[in-house]
């Protein structure tokens, strides 16, 4: 490794980002104690002045929500944490360069799975992010990632699957057997930045075919 670290008071300062919610996290290290307090600062790439994050000064928890401070998804940011423990000198560590566009992971989509007699409908709900457009409205994942598409799978049994893919939000798997349980999975993909969400999974049973009862 290229760094010899002997401070022991503060380690692993990094951003954890999901759907553009950007949380700064860190570990205390072996020398930290219950009275160790942490203060957080942040800045944009190329800026000289570090800005103190209100609400994250002399705190004891090991995380700080910097979503609002880092909400420009085309910008690069840094954050740093200063740890102070009674009787010892302060220790400061900074993050690597952070871009939410590059580094955020995508959560599973929010999906409604609707069973019918011989089909299953899947409705994908738009995912709002904290990212703002120029006119101030919250952007959806689809608006940020223009190449975003959905991959849907329906597991009929252990050996047979049906597949659908697309950019639209409404899908229907047709030609299914009534009164049968199926396992659906829906994944978000953004190929340009090689992002892939974990799947949303729904277990759903087609409705029984009642038509014979009335013939």
């Amino acid at each position: 490794h290229t760094t010899v670290d002997t401070s022991g008071l503060l380690q692993h300062v990094k951003f954890q980002s999901s759907n553009f919610e950007n949380i700064l996290t860190w570990d205390g290290g072996p020398a930290s104690t219950s009275d160790t307090v942490y203060s957080v600062e942040y800045k944009k790439y190329g800026e000289r002045k570090w800005l103190a994050k209100a609400g994250c000064q002399r705190i004891t928890q090991k995380f700080c929500n910097l979503t609002m401070e880092t909400r420009n998804h085309t910008e690069f940011y840094y954050a740093k944490v200063t740890a102070v423990s009674a009787g010892g000198p302060p220790v400061t560590k900074m993050t690597d360069r952070f871009s939410s566009l590059q580094h955020t992971t995508i959560k599973p989509p929010d999906v409604t799975c609707i069973p019918k007699v011989r089909s299953i409908q899947m409705l994908v709900h738009p995912t709002l992010t904290p990212v703002l457009s120029e006119d101030g409205h919250q952007l959806t994942l689809e608006e940020i990632f223009h190449d975003l598409f959905y991959r849907l799978e329906l597991h009929v049994n252990h050996t047979y699957q049906m597949h659908l893919e697309g950019k639209q939000r409404e899908y229907e798997f047709l030609g299914l057997t009534p009164d049968t349980e199926f396992l659906g999975s829906i994944t978000i993909l953004t190929p340009i930045l090689s992002k892939e969400s974990a799947p949303y999974v729904c277990r759903v049973k087609t409705l029984p075919d009642r038509t014979w009862a009335y013939s």
Epitope: T2, G46, E75, T92, K93, M94, T95, D96, R97
Partner: antibody, heavy 116, light 113 residues
Framework: EVQLVESGGGLVQPGGSLRLSCAAS????????MNWVRQAPGKGLEWIGE????????TYNQKFKGRFTISVDQSKNTAYLQMNSLRAEDTAVYYC?????????WGQGTLVTVSS | DIVMTQSPDSLAVSLGERATINCKSS????????????LAWYQQKPGQPPKLLIY???SRESGVPDRFSGSGSGTDFTLTISSLQAEDVAVYYC?????????FGQGTKVEIK
């Protein structure tokens, strides 16, 4: 007051190795990125690479990748440039310089001469 | 790599006169997120390390005399010394920090006529 002081330069034979040091004072080295820049005699400036002293993450100019390695010892508040397989054209003054984009503080430089 | 080309290579200016140095980049240095240009200027005197004068193309570094100013956008930039002083004799470099590897111009030597 921020100060950067390089050391470790000198005469080395072609094919040899050298490790340069950059001792930082007046601030914690983990609070800003550190870079190495070189300047051949009578020539311009050439960026070698950078390190985030907190994480050890490095970015190099492709020209130097493989032969040159940047590292940090946080306890000594010091950055290093390890140079291997040195050639005559590596003869230059080597500077460490602080910051992540442009460079606000520079050391005085240390001269490396590669000659047989 | 982004290539930085300065002109002229050297210039001689009378004391009190204006000195103008140009720097051209092989691609735009306009940083879309803040609409600023990722360009810095340095002054280097003989036997000394470079000294930061200007960053973001036009922001003057603290302590730098106001006779130094930077301008330009996109690919064309200028460093102007409005009234040359004897202590301004040096080599001046531009540097881009738009993308890796960071690159410098070849330098412009400013002398007194």
């Amino acid at each position: 007051e921020v100060q950067l002081v390089e050391s470790g330069g000198g005469l080395v034979q072609p094919g040899g190795s050298l490790r340069l040091s950059c001792a930082a004072s007046g601030y914690s080295i983990t609070a800003e990125y550190m870079n190495w820049v070189r300047q051949a005699p009578g020539k311009g400036l050439e960026w070698i690479g950078e390190i985030n002293p907190s994480t050890g993450t490095t970015t190099y100019n492709q020209k130097f990748k493989g032969r040159f390695t940047i590292s940090v010892d946080q306890s000594k508040n010091t950055a290093y440039l390890q140079m291997n397989s040195l050639r005559a054209e590596d003869t230059a003054v080597y500077y460490c310089a602080r910051f992540d984009a442009y460079f606000d503080y520079w050391g005085q430089g240390t001269l490396v001469t590669v000659s047989s | 790599d982004i290539v930085m080309t300065q002109s002229p290579d050297s210039l001689a200016v009378s004391l009190g006169e204006r000195a103008t140095i140009n720097c051209k980049s092989s691609q735009s240095l306009l940083y879309s997120s803040n609409q600023k240009n990722t360009l810095a200027w340095y002054q280097q005197k003989p036997g000394q390390p470079p000294k930061l004068l200007i960053y973001w193309a036009s922001s003057r570094e603290s302590g730098v005399p106001d006779r130094f100013s930077g301008s330009g956008s996109g690919t064309d930039f200028t460093l102007t010394i409005s009234s040359l002083q004897a202590e301004d004799v040096a080599v001046y470099y531009c540097q881009q920090y738009y993308s890796y590897p960071f690159t410098f111009g070849q330098g412009t030597k400013v002398e007194i006529k």
